[in-house]
Amino acid sequence: QTSVSPSKVILPRGGSVLVTCSTSCDQPKLLGIETPLPKKELLLPGNNRKVYELSNVQEDSQPMCYSNCPDGQSTAKTFLTVYWTPERVELAPLPSWQPVGKNLTLRCQVEGGAPRANLTVVLLRGEKELKREPAVGEPAEVTTTVLVRRDHHGANFSCRTELDLRPQGLELFENTSAPYQLQTFVLPATPPQLVSPRVLEVDTQGTVVCSLDGLFPVSEAQVHLALGDQRLNPTVTYGNDSFSAKASVSVTAEDEGTQRLTCAVILGNQSQETLQTVTIYSFPAPNVILTKPEVSEGTEVTVKCEAHPRAKVTLNGVPAQPLGPRAQLLLKATPEDNGRSFSCSATLEVAGQLIHKNQTRELRVLYGPRLDERDCPGNWTWPENSQQTPMCQAWGNPLPELKCLKDGTFPLPIGESVTVTRDLEGTYLCRARSTQGEVTRKVTVNVLSPRYE
């Protein structure tokens, strides 16, 4: 009778074991062990017992002791079970961001590990077990579905293997995968609200505001504002579940035309976008052109108004005929036209909006000098010793210089209050002089003496 000890062994992969083969007869013809494993016999006294060291045991094996005794041949097997923890325990890669309300499938792959009968795979959220299954197949795969909730944000999911060798007198060997940190988010189906000017003039600044409610977690939302290829740099203000992004936009002549204004909100692996068109226009004020800004009385003057090719102008309230970007009027300059304003108003339609621009020019008419009866009476009669103010107003543009002299030397104090004396009496020659020429007028002062009364 052949016996083996131990009859059952559990050992780590690559490990060694001592196996004793014994026989019940004293003088066996043969006693040995049959195994593909490297073996080393340990020398013992007697010939009915042999001890072998079996080394580098990589997989389950059943070495067989055999003996040949006078009463026949017999065998006995020992069962070597190799244990080893899994090589890799991994959660299948997932996007770190998951939308709330979506079903998330967690898949754990376990490579290797033995004995499989003692190997269990556990899927966890934090320390909470979601699923526990025996490891089957290579790789062993365990999956579970999780309905993503808002309160799962930041939760760690992991996969753990348990090689439970406690029934065999060993321990519980655990391997855990790298955790997968779930980041949940809510991005509403409604696009962001975009408030901006519909039209914007070249070389001016406008303000753009993009906002959205119902986001979670709002602090993780990325906002991208752009006008055409120009990225805007907004100032973002966050609420509990909302944000408002405000940016200044400057446009130049290069941007002229219809541009796309976009506001994109990116949260997790999703985005919402709002597009709006902004028309960038160039509309200089109309040009008022006078033949000459300063003309002499009687000169023919042309007043022209020129504006943007697509504008419609009115000149001094009179629309261009035909309606268009140009208007003009002709006049013969009179003194009354001096200081007259010529106002041109231009209207341009940009993206359905009417834009108005004005420009005004003043005409200067050179005339005179002029001395007439109304403003410079030819006869004054004043009582002697009375207080009087001689008045003589010369007209013209430029304003003439006025001098009234008696006998070429004695001046009449124009505009000054004087006491009338006999000396004041006489005929004065009033001379008004300007760059436009000169005029003269005789003014006679009569003084009434009391004795004549």
Epitope: E87, R88, V89, Q109, E111, G112, R116, V136, G137, E138, P139, E141, A178
Partner: antibody
Framework: QVQLQQSGAEVKKPGASVKISCKAS????????LHWVRQAPGQRLEWIGV????????KYSQKFQGKVTITRDTSASTAYLELSSLRSEDTAIHYC?????????????WGQGTALTVSS | DVVLTQTPLSSPVTLGQPASISCRSS???????????LHWYLQRAGQPPRLLIY???NRFSGVPDRFSGSGAGTDFTLKISRVEAEDVGVYFC?????????FGGGTKLEIK
């Protein structure tokens, strides 16, 4: 004892397809994955892909994606490597090898190899 | 892809003498779980490769203890303490840390 028996040598014309088999014995077929490796003349060994004999899931080297298809028949304990649109560069010895799915403990048992010659 | 460079390309050795083969990786072969999946194979003429060492230093079953593996990170070595006639062939290192899995170019061991 563990054995992987591969189908015989193949000679194919460019543009044709070929399907090589690898029959496993001496162990529980679904306990191990099967990998395919090729050795072209004068070239180093190249890993082609792997199949989980249990689930049928496959993983391929980017180089061979679209070129090869690995399948298995659990009832016959056999894995297959199919190569399509053959070119002369596909001339090589193709080996199947037993291992864990990610090959972490090495390829412990290999088939004898199937020589594929692609020539017009 | 990870490139494994073996040196020498060829190694003539006297029977009974030691032999050493080096394998250098273009990047670390330490996996995120701390294990290093570097293996060694021997391919004799007309035969498929045969696993000798797995995970840097673990001898596969049936592999004589004259074979040993060592190394870490990017540098690995296969040593044969006393070369025997049956050790002749091409030795390959291989990595299963990074996808796709790759092999070294091989080192031919021959008897002087």
């Amino acid at each position: 004892q563990v054995q992987l028996q591969q189908s015989g040598a193949e000679v194919k014309k460019p543009g044709a397809s070929v399907k090589i088999s690898c029959k496993a014995s001496g162990y529980t077929f679904t306990d191990y994955a099967l990998h395919w490796v090729r050795q072209a003349p004068g070239q180093r060994l190249e890993w082609i892909g792997v199949i989980s004999t249990y689930s049928g899931n496959t993983k391929y080297s980017q180089k061979f994606q679209g070129k090869v298809t690995i399948t298995r028949d659990t009832s016959a304990s056999t894995a297959y490597l199919e190569l399509s649109s053959l070119r002369s560069e596909d001339t090589a010895i193709h080996y199947c090898a037993r291992s864990l799915y990610f090959g972490s403990s090495g390829f412990d048992y290999w088939g004898q190899g199937t020589a594929l010659t692609v020539s017009s | 892809d990870v490139v494994l460079t073996q040196t020498p390309l060829s190694s003539p050795v006297t029977l009974g003498q030691p032999a050493s083969i080096s394998c250098r990786s273009s990047q670390t072969l330490v996996y995120r779980n701390g294990n290093t999946y570097l293996h060694w194979y021997l391919q004799r003429a007309g035969q498929p490769p045969r696993l000798l060492i797995y995970k840097v230093s673990n001898r596969f079953s049936g592999v004589p203890d004259r074979f040993s593996g060592s190394g870490a990170g990017t540098d690995f070595t296969l040593k044969i303490s006393r070369v025997e006639a049956e050790d002749v062939g091409v030795y390959f290192c291989s990595q299963n840390t990074h996808f796709p899995y790759t092999f070294g170019g091989g080192t031919k061991l021959e008897i002087k």
